[in-house]
């Protein structure tokens, strides 16, 4: 059975009724977040390996909406929810409080002010 | 403006009204082609860097629907159309008549009987 996916912003990727877009321009985490917000979206939130299995094949490194809260040592998403255990393998290449998404559900810790490409997501 | 994408088979990726699916199981080119056909689709056809720019971020190597015609030395798609110039960078890693898609619009020549993952595509 075939079905429609969305709705999504024009020319975004639609998968399992979520919308994704990969942006080529390099911005720091805060600028990336602002860019997504201006498009009525947020930086990528990884919430399910099954529902988001397209992400396992993503090449390179891209800002996602995950930030480190130094006061309690946790990682949380822009919406305030805590990173679920076993969803991402967190890798600390350097000190930082923001995270880049990399293929196969890995999160690379990075300084939030470093420019990187980014992934926006809109949940429908 | 937001819009719906598709229609596509359930749980396929929809992008610019084309449907894509990445299959994890390794099959040779012929088995991969048969798998796509059984789902009313074909192996990936690359026809536009603009309309298919999601492909630039694909990690790893996957069978696509491109085959070498030894009699005239050309590369053509399953539908018989000839590979357009400048669409793919063809890289001859070894002797073969089938091609794997790799990120940034590269095609790697491979023996058709070698098992690989594959990408199916359905144009709406």
């Amino acid at each position: 059975t075939e079905s429609y996916c969305g709705p999504c912003p024009k020319n975004w990727i639609c998968y399992k009724n979520n919308c994704y877009q990969f942006f080529d321009e390099s911005k720091n985490w805060y600028e990336s977040q602002a860019s997504c917000m201006s498009q009525n979206a947020s930086l990528l939130k990884v919430y399910s390996k099954e529902d988001q299995d397209l992400l396992k094949l993503v090449k390179s490194y891209h800002w996602m909406g995950l930030v480190h809260i130094p006061t309690n040592g946790s990682w949380q998403w822009e919406d305030g929810s805590i990173l679920s255990p076993n969803l991402l393998t967190i890798i600390e290449m350097q000190k930082g409080d923001c995270a880049l998404y990399a293929s196969s559900f890995k999160g690379y810790i990075e300084n939030c002010s470093t420019p990187n490409t980014y992934i926006c997501m809109q949940r429908t | 403006t937001e819009s719906y994408c598709g229609p596509c088979p359930k749980n396929w990726i929809c992008y610019k009204n084309n449907c894509y699916q990445f299959f994890d199981e390794s099959k040779n080119w012929y088995e991969s082609q048969a798998s796509c056909m059984s789902q009313n689709a074909s192996l990936l056809k690359v026809y536009s860097k603009e309309d298919q720019d999601l492909l630039k971020l694909v990690k790893s190597y996957h069978w696509m629907g491109l085959v070498h015609i030894p009699t005239n030395g050309s590369w053509q798609w399953e539908d018989g159309s000839i590979l357009s110039p400048n669409l793919l960078t063809i890289i001859e890693m070894q002797k073969g008549d089938c091609a794997l898609y790799a990120s940034s619009f590269k095609g790697y020549i491979e023996n058709c009987s070698t098992p690989n993952t594959y990408i199916c595509m359905q144009r709406t």
């Epitope: 130094p70 309690n72 040592g73 946790s74 990682w75 805590i82 393998t89 600390e92 290449m93 350097q94 | -």
Partner: antibody, heavy 120, light 107 residues
Framework: QVQLQQSGPGLVQPSQSLSITCTVS????????VHWVRQSPGKGLEWLGV???????DYNAAFISRLSISKDNSKRQVFFKMSSLQANDTAIYYC??????????????WGQGTTVTVSS | DIQLTQSPAILSVSPGERVSFSCRAS??????IHWYQQRTNGSPRLLIK???ESISGIPSRFSGSGSGTDFTLSINGVESEDIADYYC?????????FGAGTKLEIK
Amino acid sequence: QVQLQQSGPGLVQPSQSLSITCTVSGFSLTIYGVHWVRQSPGKGLEWLGVIWSGGSTDYNAAFISRLSISKDNSKRQVFFKMSSLQANDTAIYYCSRKSHDGYYGVMDYWGQGTTVTVSS
Amino acid sequence: DIQLTQSPAILSVSPGERVSFSCRASQSIGTSIHWYQQRTNGSPRLLIKYASESISGIPSRFSGSGSGTDFTLSINGVESEDIADYYCQQSNTWPLTFGAGTKLEIK
């Protein structure tokens, strides 16, 4: 000032459990995580596990089946328990504070250590 | 697990000399390396974090450098109180691991 004070038995019978308490002062367990590390002549320093300020834990996979770390924030105490000890678990056991820098583990203050001998 | 190899096992220097400790990781770990000093019968003490960042209260003669797989701790002008074991530790990924240590001796 920041201090971590450890208390626990020096001698443990083979197959028995080890319990150590780490009592902290100069900082709050609701804000800082606490790591556990042991040191033996044979294996050097080995990271065992951590309890985060929020109460969740992460363990070294080599010890996950017999290790438990818990805490009581109001008493400023962290509790370490390891079961089924054998002679090769003889070591000095340390608690240490996880600094705010980075995610995983910069240990900026350490307890005095608890020397544990496993013997009958 | 990430292995950390420290060399040499023992360093013997004269007071006032500059000394360097090496730590090599089995894979690239960026700058996620930290250095500790442990004096005889004492607990480890943090000297350097994230390869090169200094720690409040640690004498300025201690410094660190490196990234990727090769890291160095240096003491510029060794003093007798520096007699100790020195360990590197990585925080790139679980489990956290330590090097086997280098013992500093004074001639």
